[in-house]
């Protein structure tokens, strides 16, 4: 059986300040079991944008119903974009672990650029 792949089809997305940005992500498999998280940036300084498992992420909505059986679409939409939101966003699959989930595989990243709001 092929190992899960994390697919972020767009290398870059550009939106105007104040608009919503859709960041696409899909998995090729339901295995291994574990949550998806979205981060802005990589390495130790990355920002948690969305955690499927827990937390409150008011500007983030999921494009599809993540709890739906056999769902492989983990795209998100971020509302009311500002210049501070610019950066590269990574969709990351975690493998369920005890006590902590373990990072399994990351997408290649989607760079979000923010244009000035048209006057």
């Amino acid at each position: 059986e092929d190992e899960l792949q994390v697919i972020q089809p767009e290398k870059s997305v550009s939106v105007a300040a104040g608009e919503s940005a859709t960041l696409r992500c899909a998995m090729t498999s339901l295995i291994p079991v574990g949550p998806i998280m979205w981060f802005r940036g990589a390495g130790a300084g990355r920002e948690l944008i969305y955690n499927q498992k827990e937390g409150h992420f008011p500007r983030v909505t999921t494009v599809s119903e993540l709890t739906k059986r056999n769902n492989l679409d983990f795209s998100i939409s971020i509302s009311n974009i500002t210049p501070a939101d610019a950066g590269t966003y990574y969709c990351v699959k975690f493998r369920k672990g005890s006590p902590d989930d373990v990072e399994f595989k990351s997408g290649a990243g989607t760079e979000l650029s923010v244009r000035a709001k048209p006057s």
Partner: antibody
Framework: DVQLVESGGGVVRPGESLRLSCAAS????????MNWVRQAPGEGLEWVSR????????DYAESVKGRFTISRDNSENTLYLQMNSLRAEDTAVYYC????????????WGLGALVTVSS | ETVLTQSPATLSVSPGERATLSCRAS??????LAWHQQKPGQAPRLLIY???NRATGIPDRFSGSGSGTDFTLTISSLQTEDSAVYYC??????????FGGGTKVEIK
């Protein structure tokens, strides 16, 4: 209910060190960026430092850069501010503040800890 | 860096009357502006976020308006317990996070 409780304030001499703690409860601590904000006697609010949800990303006000270090222990739901080489102008009430999301306002504040730097 | 200028520095209003506080940004901050209330001897408390949205548990006599560079906090019918300093905060560009200098609201 969200609660943020600071401790560790006190009176120190110029050049000395102090470590503030902020115990958090009532929310998913590991999902939120956290901040320290201070208020000198009779003055307004001054942002001091920010740490991202995972603890690997930090930002500082120019006035404290190189002297203060922000950190967090997500397993203990605790935020810290290590203050070295303290100066008289660092005298203030220090508040810890929860950030609504990774790029947002401060939605909950602690009660504050008074730090007095005096010879 | 974005500078926030609040006016007036002090506002004296009779109970039941309207209080209007202003916050002006040196460059656009979109709708990314919050208002915090700080009563004497207490920690700040969030009142308004995203320029117009009331935080949980905030009475509807508090309202926010504006976008871009000019913002207003209105207290429609001032109560004695509204005596406080009010700060605006922008979160469009950061770091650093910036607060205005504050407006002190006094009861006449």
């Amino acid at each position: 209910d969200v609660q943020l409780v600071e401790s560790g304030g006190g009176v120190v001499r110029p050049g000395e060190s102090l470590r503030l703690s902020c115990a958090a409860s009532g929310f998913s601590f590991s999902s939120h960026a956290m901040n320290w904000v201070r208020q000198a006697p009779g003055e307004g609010l001054e942002w001091v430092s920010r740490i991202n949800s995972g603890g690997g990303g930090t930002d500082y006000a120019e006035s404290v850069k190189g002297r203060f270090t922000i950190s967090r222990d997500n397993s203990e739901n605790t935020l810290y501010l290590q203050m070295n080489s303290l100066r008289a102008e660092d005298t203030a009430v220090y508040y810890c503040a929860k950030q609504y999301d990774w790029n947002g306002f401060f939605d909950y504040w602690g009660l504050g800890a008074l730090v007095t730097v005096s010879s | 860096e974005t500078v926030l200028t609040q006016s007036p520095a002090t506002l004296s209003v009779s109970p039941g009357e309207r209080a209007t506080l202003s916050c002006r940004a040196s460059q656009t901050v979109g709708s990314k502006l919050a208002w915090h209330q700080q009563k004497p001897g207490q920690a700040p408390r969030l009142l308004i976020y995203d320029a117009t949205n009331r935080a949980t548990g905030i009475p509807d006599r508090f309202s926010g308006s504006g976008s871009g560079t000019d913002f207003t906090l209105t207290i429609s019918s001032l109560q004695t317990e509204d005596s406080a300093v009010y700060y605006c905060q922008q979160y469009y560009y950061w770091p650093p996070y910036r607060f205005g200098g504050g407006t002190k609201v006094e009861i006449k």
